[in-house]
């Protein structure tokens, strides 16, 4: 798929979305921490 999202199976799609959500939360937290430290 051109958008890089695995859609052959719903459960794999959901797992990938969960990982993306988790990474976004972690990276967002790190970014906020960096801004705070400045």
């Amino acid at each position: 798929h051109s958008d890089g999202i695995f859609t052959d199976s719903y459960s794999r799609y959901r797992k990938q979305m969960a990982v993306k959500k988790y990474l976004a939360a972690v990276l967002g937290k790190r970014y906020k921490q960096r801004v705070k430290n400045k």
Partner: antibody, heavy 121, light 111 residues
Framework: DVKLVESGGGLVKPGGSLKVSCAAS????????MSWVRQTPEKRLDWVAT????????WYPDSVKGRFTISRDNARNTLFLQMSSLRSEDTALYYC??????????????WGQGTSVTVSS | DIVLTQSPASLAVSLGQRATISCKAS??????????MTWYQQKPGQPPKLLIY???NLDSGIPARFSGSGSGTDFTLNIHPVEEEDAATYYC?????????FGGGTKLEIK
Amino acid sequence: DVKLVESGGGLVKPGGSLKVSCAASGFAFNNYDMSWVRQTPEKRLDWVATITGGGSYTWYPDSVKGRFTISRDNARNTLFLQMSSLRSEDTALYYCARLNGYDQAGAMDYWGQGTSVTVSS
Amino acid sequence: DIVLTQSPASLAVSLGQRATISCKASQSVDYDGDSYMTWYQQKPGQPPKLLIYAASNLDSGIPARFSGSGSGTDFTLNIHPVEEEDAATYYCQQSNEDPWTFGGGTKLEIK
């Protein structure tokens, strides 16, 4: 209160088409993936289709692929199932169901009361 | 397709006793640490009701007398102590692999 109400079922001849709808209320419809599941007269449950919250992705079993199309209108909080080339084995009670929103995929936490589809000549 | 075989097809349990329902999959329904197994309860004239997701997680509002266990290919639904209102048909469902499939159901009667 979460509510799902199906409509549009009826009697259709083999080879015919039918579009059933599911009106959703009581939750942020566009945030939830949705499914159609049918129950045969013998009480067997069959998964029919699933669509993501935004409507970008859909999944079907081979038994209905190319004949059934799941879609949604998030502005109207409505889920659809367009059925064509209907066969006698498609006779069932058709339920719309909400996916539970957890990272655990495939569990359906709210179901409508169903709409009956009979395929017979 | 993954075939789910439920046993027994029906059982009668005395009030207050334990009901045990088995669901065996033709291949593993586990993926990346999760078991994609769900249990539903259905009473006559009603749609299925979610009881347990991810093999052992109780859905909100479901009494603690319901519990689910298992991984891989063998899963169990336990109800203890059984109450009158638990008379229903119970279905397992896997969503690890498309197509999602359901077991044939187990009818529970309360004695």
